[in-house]
Structures are given as structure tokens and as C-alpha cells.
């Protein structure tokens, strides 16, 4: 294998630190140069790499969406950590957005788990103790106080 002279635009920008790859791989916080001879540092707050790699570029940092709070900023070795705001959660099967937590359980159910950034409130049937499917109840199903009945809120 032979290599032609590097084109001038391949040379690193001054602010990007360089080191040599180890067995063809660059450490976390770096990516490899086109010719495989140098490790180039990721740009703090812009991109990152978490593992030893031979990729031509670092991965772009995540930007927290509105409705999310930033728990920790992006570094050259770790992506931004975002979390849903209080009162909202993100499910594993729909990770693209934070959803509002339910304010109460359907009729005949009691709350056994609070709203967290990762899960909706958890409801179980009063008698059987089996979990509710997690579907948002229709408005008329939600437990509310009615005249002559003591309120038994789930939240």
C-alpha cells in the first residue's frame, strides 16, 4: 500500500491537538486522520468520541430539546446528558420526546409509583394489584371527586 502526498487542506487546524494512534486506533476524545497517522482531538462542546476508534470524525454533541434539562454538558469523551423536565417522562419505545405524566389513575386503581423522568405514574388495580397497561385514560375514567363521595386522589 502506498500513499500520495497529503493535500494541503488535510493539515490540522492549529486548535486541534494531535497524537499518534496506538495499533491503528485513537483514544476516546479523538478521531483518526485520513492517512491514519494522527489522532485529532474532538472539539469540546461540539463533538465527542467515547471509545478507541479509527473513525474519520467525532460524533456531534446532542442538544437538549425544549422540555428537557441538561444534566451534564458534552465533553470530548461523553455526550450531553439530557433529562425530561419535572412532570414529564421519556419511554424507551418513544425516545424522541418527553410526554406529560398522567395526573391520576383510572377508576378502581391506585398509584404505586411516581412520575419520574423515565416513567409515567404507575397504577395497579385495587383488588388484584395488577399493573395498568400505561395507556392514558379517557377523561371520564380518571378518578375525580363527585358530590357526596370523598375524594381519593391518585396523585
Amino acid at each position: 500500500i502506498t500513499q500520495q502526498d497529503l493535500a494541503p487542506q488535510q493539515r490540522a487546524a492549529p486548535q486541534q491537538k494531535r497524537s499518534s494512534p496506538s495499533e491503528g486506533l485513537c483514544p476516546p476524545g479523538h478521531h483518526i486522520s485520513e492517512d491514519g497517522r494522527d489522532c485529532i482531538s474532538c472539539k469540546y462542546g461540539q463533538d465527542y468520541s467515547t471509545h478507541w476508534n479509527d473513525l474519520l470524525f467525532c460524533l456531534r454533541c446532542t442538544r437538549c430539546d425544549s422540555g428537557e434539562v441538561e444534566l451534564s454538558p458534552c465533553t470530548t469523551t461523553r455526550n450531553t446528558v439530557c433529562q425530561c423536565e419535572e412532570g414529564t417522562f421519556r419511554e424507551e419505545d418513544s425516545p424522541e420526546m418527553c410526554r406529560k405524566c398522567r395526573t391520576g389513575c383510572p377508576r378502581g386503581m391506585v398509584k404505586v409509583g411516581d412520575c419520574t423522568p423515565w416513567s409515567d405514574i404507575e397504577c395497579v388495580h385495587k383488588e388484584s394489584g395488577t399493573k395498568h397497561s400505561g395507556e392514558v385514560p379517557a377523561v371520564e375514567e380518571t378518578v375525580t371527586s363527585s358530590p357526596g363521595t370523598p375524594a381519593s386522589p391518585c396523585s
Partner: nanobody, 123 residues
Framework: EVQLLESGGGEVQPGGSLRLSCAAS????????MGWFRQAPGKEREFLAV????????YYAESVKGRFTISRDNAKNTVYLQMSSLRAEDTAVYYC????????????????WGQGTLVTVKP
């Protein structure tokens, strides 16, 4: 979705020339390399050359250095392989491929492949 379309293959006499083209679409990486490989019947796929998009770094296999030239047209997202002084042993299916790894001269470093174009060198 990444798509690679090779063209320019055909039959040519020994000592003749051909230019292969590979048009790429769906590439959204900050940088990548586009390489050429070939596979003759009953043989392993062989690396020929790669050119990188950002810096223009080029690698050649010794077997084709001086006879084959890789080039690119950034505006058309197309890479070319100019082949000259062709020999019977250059007969093979020629493949275009994309890598996001540095110094990529091994087949396993390539993630996307075209369907290939046949080059036949015979008198």
C-alpha cells in the same frame, strides 16, 4: 439511504484504457473515503485505491500504482478510476465502496458497497 452506482465497465483489449465512475447519494457524513475494489472469479476481493473527501488523501495498492488513478468530483459526489495499460489479469468485477475510517485499505473497513461493474480485458 446510501446508494452507490458504478458505470464504465466493458470489454477492452490488452494495453487499452477504461474510466470507471461511481456516483454516490445519501452520504451525510462529515468526511468519508470512496474506494475501488475488484474481484476476479474464484479470488478474494482486492483493494485498489481510496480517496478521502475532506483532505483528498489517496492510497493505492502496489499492484495498480502507476497504472490506475483515482480522482473525485465533489460537486457531483462522484469518484473515478482511470485504468490504463490494462492486462488480462485485470479482468474482474470492479466495486465502489464507502468508508468512514482512516487509512482504509481493508475490505472490512467499508460499510457501503455498489453492485459492481464488469471489466473484461481480452485480445
Amino acid at each position: 439511504e446510501v446508494q452507490l452506482l458504478e458505470s464504465g465497465g466493458g470489454e477492452v483489449q490488452p494495453g487499452g484504457s477504461l474510466r470507471l465512475s461511481c456516483a454516490a447519494s445519501g452520504l451525510t457524513f462529515p468526511n468519508y473515503g470512496m474506494g475501488w475494489f475488484r474481484q476476479a472469479p474464484g479470488k478474494e476481493r482486492e483493494f485498489l485505491a481510496v480517496i478521502y473527501w475532506s483532505g483528498g488523501t489517496v492510497y493505492y495498492a502496489e499492484s495498480v500504482k502507476g497504472r490506475f488513478t483515482i480522482s473525485r468530483d465533489n460537486a457531483k459526489n462522484t469518484v473515478y478510476l482511470q485504468m490504463s495499460s490494462l492486462r488480462a489479469e485485470d479482468t474482474a468485477v470492479y466495486y465502489c465502496a464507502v468508508t468512514i475510517r482512516g487509512a482504509a485499505t481493508q475490505t472490512w473497513k467499508y460499510d457501503y458497497w455498489g453492485q459492481g461493474t464488469l471489466v473484461t480485458v481480452k485480445p
